[in-house]
Interface confidence: low
């Protein structure tokens, strides 16, 4: 079964996923998607990296760690009950069928009831967007997948590969850490 992680409504959720680059800066594309890892790619992609940078993300999803050192753990900001479910971290090692797939189950619990503060802090002021501080502006044009033929600012999401639905729940038991090279 999937490894399970928990968070409370309103908190940030953390889903760990790591790999060891073969050499410094020798990055491997990674995608994070909602739903169990299918045979190929990720399903509904929420974040993607390529050999150089984070090239696609959606609001509330970011990498807090140093992805250039292989820490591709996903942070989901200000979670709600709807964020519960399985997430796929796919480390897209070059070569056919070499990908490493990790399914992580996120369980969201209702927030503990506490007395309301006299004045609520603005959430976005308390938690500024990591992606902005890293210099990743919003994608100007949304197109598909980890595609080699378009600018990084244009890249968006979608599984580049067709999958046989019978194999879509190809789940792993191992922890989400691998070594490459």
């Amino acid at each position: 079964s999937e490894v399970e992680y928990r968070a409370e409504v309103g908190q940030n959720a953390y889903l760990p996923c790591f790999y060891t680059p073969a050499a410094p800066g020798n990055l491997v594309p990674v995608c994070w998607g909602k739903g169990a890892c299918p045979v190929f790619e990720c399903g509904n992609v929420v974040l993607r990296t390529d050999e150089r940078d984070v090239n696609y993300w959606t609001s509330r999803y970011w990498l807090n760690g140093d992805f250039r050192k292989g820490d591709v753990s996903l942070t989901i900001e200000n979670v709600t009950l709807a964020d519960s479910g399985i997430y796929c971290c796919r480390i897209q090692i070059p070569g056919i069928m070499n990908d490493e797939k990790f399914n992580l189950k996120l369980v969201i619990k209702p927030a503990k009831v506490t007395p309301a503060p006299t004045r609520q802090r603005d959430f976005t002021a308390a938690f500024p967007r990591m992606l902005t501080t890293r210099g990743h502006g919003p994608a100007e044009t949304q197109t598909l997948g980890s595609l080699p033929d378009i600018n990084l600012t244009q890249i968006s999401t979608l599984a580049n590969e067709l999958r046989d639905s019978r194999l879509a729940n190809d789940l792993r038991d191992s922890g989400a850490t691998i070594r490459i090279g």
Partner: antibody, heavy 114, light 112 residues
């Protein structure tokens, strides 16, 4: 089993609006994106774009920017294609197709005629 | 846009014969990860397309083994050994590496 069931045929006049539905069953709707594909009478297939069913973010091919809108009703596992200001050249069969087009709806025939 | 050119436009065959359809792309369909994003569909009259082969040579679930795909780079072939009546229809190739996704013009497989 996995099924995509589309709404029935439509007859519209130029300038009107149409909204075509695609109801999914047999899988978790929000785990797979939804594509839309156009097939004009006697012609080939043209990819219109897709919508991420988890984030709701649509992507449109260049030829389908402006009058075309993809949307979702997640609670009903349904994707929608809306075409505004209909033109005669919108006459076609429109297909929804899951993710990378592994499963398709049966198609919705739209006829635009004055 | 990537242009997908299919030949022939029409392919008359006798039942039991072998059929071969060619698809050529205007750009390479090979991704840096080593995969090639070329797929084949069959559309029967009045029906939606059905996926037959994905990634050049992988048969989709439920597709008979008389269907096979081959090729690399920009040149691809779909072969049907022992054509059956249920195989008749229009075959499309498509690519899903370059945006927008594009389809070939179709090859109509019909009885000779």
């Amino acid at each position: 089993q996995i099924q995509l069931v589309q709404s029935g045929p439509e007859l519209k006049k130029p300038g009107e609006t149409v909204k075509i539905s695609c109801k999914a069953s047999g899988y978790t709707f929000t785990n797979y994106g939804m594509n839309w594909v156009k097939q004009a009478p006697g012609k080939g297939l043209k990819w219109m774009g897709w919508i991420n069913t988890y984030t709701g973010e649509p992507t449109y091919a260049d030829d389908f920017k402006g009058r075309f809108a993809f949307s979702l009703e997640t609670s009903a596992s349904t994707a929608y294609l809306q075409i505004n200001n209909l033109k005669n050249e919108d006459t076609a069969t429109y297909f929804c197709a899951r993710d990378l087009m592994d499963y398709w709806g049966q198609g919705t025939t739209l006829t635009v005629s004055s | 846009d990537v242009v997908m050119t299919q030949t022939p436009l029409s392919l008359p065959v006798s039942l039991g014969d072998q059929a071969s359809i060619s698809c050529r792309s205007s750009q390479s369909l090979v991704h840096s990860n080593g995969n090639t994003y070329l797929h084949w569909y069959l559309q029967k009259p009045g029906q939606s397309p059905k996926l037959l082969i994905y990634k050049v040579s992988n048969r989709f679930s439920g597709v008979p083994d008389r269907f096979s795909g081959s090729g690399s780079g920009t040149d691809f072939t779909l072969k049907i050994t022992r054509v059956e009546a249920e195989d008749l229809g229009v075959y499309f190739c498509s690519q899903s590496i370059h945006v927008p996704y594009t389809f070939g013009g179709g090859t109509k497989l019909e009885i000779k």
